[in-house]
């Protein structure tokens, strides 16, 4: 799978973890830190 | 199915506001980028500007720093426009359109005229 | 804010013609654009985004390209239902479209 940093005006889009845009998927994605969750890393979970 | 739709069309004397909302079903703006461009007649395609609904930042075209307003409400997964002090060159179709995860998807468009 | 020079304005070619439109942008935009394609009356069509994707269901004649400040964007071989005019978009930093290209079939 080809990935590569997102777009400058996604930065902030993943509150808690980084942006990754997937080029075969067309699709930008969140990677969340430890702990948090949801499409944009937005849930903490214990 | 994801859906954008639009407020229908607006008729407005200059000087005046309008607001045009544009509802999302399908998903949930919160995930998303909401941004606004328009296209007056005959002319070419222009970026207004957009709202992050979740953290509720908003980030305009100087050209309409001042005029205009985008707001969104979540509880409703609704966003809204508001363009201020009218000019007949504010006559355009005005879409909204939903970026984030995916590329854009866009609203059907609404008509705004302004006419005295 | 990033400015997009979008070049011809309007171009007049035959069927069966190679159609070439640029996009130049005021810094580097990371591959970060996309083309759209517009009929009178329409909304807006997503032909390509990131550069060179195509979008399902685009045919394969529409292609595009490019990296850093210049892109290109290709038609190999027009047909008469191409005729619409063409917008390049930014969206690195926020977003800038280009001013357009009229394509007529001469």
């Known amino acids: 799978v080809s990935i590569t940093k997102c777009n400058s005006d996604m930065n902030g889009y993943c509150l808690h973890g980084q942006c990754i845009y997937l080029v075969d998927m067309s699709q930008n994605y969140c990677r969340c830190e430890v702990g948090y969750t949801g499409v944009r890393c937005e849930h903490f979970y214990l | 199915q994801d859906q954008l739709v639009q407020s229908g069309a607006e008729v407005k004397k200059p000087g005046a506001s309008v607001k045009v909302s544009c509802k999302a079903s399908g998903f949930n703006i919160k995930d998303t980028y909401i941004q606004w461009v328009r296209q007056a007649p005959g002319q070419g395609l222009e970026w207004m500007g957009r709202i992050d609904p979740l953290r509720r930042q908003t980030k305009y075209h100087e050209k309409f720093e001042g005029r205009v307003t985008i707001t969104a409400d979540t509880s409703t997964n609704t966003a809204y426009m508001e363009l201020s002090s009218l000019r007949s060159e504010d006559t355009a179709v005005y879409y909204c359109?939903?970026?984030?995860?995916?590329?854009?998807?866009w609203g059907q468009g609404t008509l705004v005229t302004v006419s005295s | 804010d990033i400015q997009m020079t979008q070049s011809p304005s309007s171009l007049s070619a035959s069927v069966g013609d190679r159609v070439t439109i640029t996009c130049k942008a005021s810094?580097?935009?990371?591959?970060?654009i996309a083309w759209y394609q517009q009929k009178p009356g329409q909304a807006p069509r997503l032909l390509i985004q990131?550069?060179?994707t195509l979008q399902p269901g685009v045919p394969s004649r529409f292609s595009g390209s490019g990296s850093g400040t210049d892109y290109t964007f290709t038609i190999s071989s027009l047909q008469p239902e191409d005729i619409a005019t063409y917008y390049c978009l930014q969206y690195d930093n926020l977003r800038t479209f280009g001013g357009g290209t009229k394509v007529e079939i001469k």
């Open positions: 359109v939903r970026s984030g995860r995916e590329f854009d998807f």
């Open positions: 810094q580097d935009i990371h591959k970060y």
């Open positions: 990131y550069t060179s």
